[in-house]
């Protein structure tokens, strides 16, 4: 139960956080214009990763998008490509974690099946996260020297008579979004690769165990063990050696309120 | 058709509160912003301050501590208040609606208000 | 405040000719943004509203004969009547659009010569 709660819940951050990512990708304002110590314009400027826009104090609200694709900066290209990476990893990670939900049941899936595409999802996800986090960090980075670059110029080009207003470009929505959205997807990830543990089947259990005969310093094999033993027949005694893996009943495929959505 | 409409008393004595009113029609003022300028006759424009669809507002900072402006949406009104008025605010007061580039399409006629004892 | 200032005061021109009135602001009022200059140009008529010719310092306003151009970027902007009629005898005020108070020009009254 606990194994599907925690598969089940990271299905659903994960969701969430890749739903953020996209939004995030999508949105206008990853940089907005800087109103601290500025004059106050009738204007107000904001960026995003494929447009860019100016909403004037009448309302109007113009935005062009970035047509050219050799002329952008590269900082700005693989901020995009991060993000559509991570898009397209947590993407394929939400369809691989469908059929591993353990709550739903897809012909005679095996556990062990379960098992793998549950942590194969939970590393696309921790993946996709991490580009997330990285896109938009970067993306930040690059705001912030831009910033200082741009204050600096506006104490040092004031010697002349005119005076130009330098727009300077702080931290949007997007950014904060993105940030909470890969962090989401990543902890999503996590849980997905602790559920898996938790879904691999008995048999998997055995392999590193040693058993000591009493009197003998002798390792077996379960195989062995099984023919002198009887052990392996009494498959309810497995609890002796599981670290709280599931007996064979529990494993059966048997239907249960559990296995239909 | 787009019109704009100011009203208002002619005369206001001096450090009275002066009241406009600017009523529209033909656009809605949840869609456009407005805009107030007065002109002291035979002298040029001088912007007082603008509200915007949202009822924020922005004032010229030479009157800043003197005039407001509010909007009352549904009446499709739009209202200016000078207080502690003098005689140099004796001028004609117009309303205006912004368009693009922040600049004024439409204006009302104007309404001419003297500040006189 | 950004000060507006326009030349000349006034000015005479002959019926056909070309008439150019000046501008200029105190700070730049283009926009890095989308690249455009927040300065609109304006038509009074002795009794009347002023009128709107151009805004963006170069687009003309729906309705306003083509002889009307709006010019310039930064802090210089010109205004021109490429052929003068009668009915253009006015006072053409500059404003600008970009930075808080969005302050006026003096105006330049144009005559007929």
């Known amino acids: 139960m606990a194994v599907t709660a925690c598969q089940g819940l990271g299905f659903v951050v994960s969701l969430i956080g890749i739903a953020g990512i996209i939004a995030a990708t999508c949105m206008d304002q990853w940089s907005t214009q800087d109103l601290y110590n500025n004059p106050v314009t009738a204007v107000f400027n904001y960026q995003g990763l494929w447009r860019s826009c100016v909403r004037e104090s009448s309302g109007f609200t113009e935005c062009r998008g970035y047509f050219t694709l050799l002329g952008l900066p590269a900082m700005l290209q693989a901020v995009r490509a991060l993000m559509i990476v991570g898009i397209v990893l947590g993407a394929i990670g939400l369809l691989v974690s469908i059929f591993a939900l353990k709550c739903i049941r897809i012909g005679s899936m095996e556990d062990s099946a379960k098992a793998n595409m549950t942590l194969t999802s939970g590393i696309m996800f921790i993946v996709s996260g991490l580009c997330a986090i990285a896109g938009v960090s970067v993306f930040a980075n690059m705001l912030v020297t831009n910033f200082w670059m741009s204050t600096a110029n506006m104490y040092t080009g004031m010697g002349g008579m005119v005076q130009t207003v330098q727009t300077r470009y702080t931290f949007g929505a997007a950014l904060f979004v993105g940030w909470v959205a890969g962090g989401l997807t990543l902890i999503g990830g996590v849980m997905m690769c602790i559920a898996c543990r938790g879904l691999a089947p008995e048999e998997t259990n055995y392999k590193a165990v040693s058993y000591h005969a009493s009197g003998h310093s002798v390792a077996y094999k379960p195989g062995g063990f099984k023919a002198s033993t009887g052990f392996g027949s009494n498959t309810k005694n497995k609890k002796i050696y599981d670290g709280g893996a599931r007996t064979e009943d529990e494993v059966q495929s048997y239907p249960s309120k559990h296995d239909y959505v | 058709q787009v019109q704009l409409q100011e009203s208002g008393p002619g005369l206001v004595k001096p450090s009275q509160t002066l009241s406009l009113t600017c009523t529209v029609s033909?656009?809605?003022?949840?869609?456009?912003?407005i805009s107030w300028v007065r002109q002291p006759a035979g002298k040029g424009l001088e912007w007082l301050g603008e509200i915007w669809t949202g009822g924020g507002t922005n004032y010229n900072s030479a009157l800043k501590s003197r005039v407001s402006i509010s909007k009352d949406n549904s009446k499709s009104q739009v209202f200016l208040k000078l207080s502690s008025v003098t005689a140099a605010d004796t001028a004609r007061y117009y309303c205006g609606r912004l368009s693009y580039g922040n600049s004024l399409d439409y204006w009302g006629q104007g309404t001419l208000v003297t500040v006189s004892s | 405040d950004i000060v507006m200032t326009q030349s000349p005061d006034s000015t005479t021109v002959l019926l056909g000719e070309r008439a150019t009135i000046n501008c200029k602001s105190s700070q730049s009022l283009l926009n890095s943004g989308n690249q455009k200059n927040y300065l609109a140009w304006y038509q009074q008529k002795p009794g009347q509203p002023p009128k709107l010719l151009i805004y963006?310092?170069?687009t003309r306003e729906s309705g306003v004969p083509d002889r009307f151009s709006g010019s310039g970027s930064g802090t210089d902007f010109t205004l021109t009547i490429s052929s003068l009629q009668a009915e253009d005898v006015a006072v053409y005020y500059c404003?600008?659009?970009?930075?808080?108070?969005?302050?006026f020009g003096p105006g330049t009254k144009l005559e007929i010569k």
């Open positions: 404003q600008n659009n970009f930075i808080y108070p969005l302050t």
């Open positions: 963006w310092a170069s």
């Open positions: 033909g656009f809605s003022l949840t869609s456009y912003a």
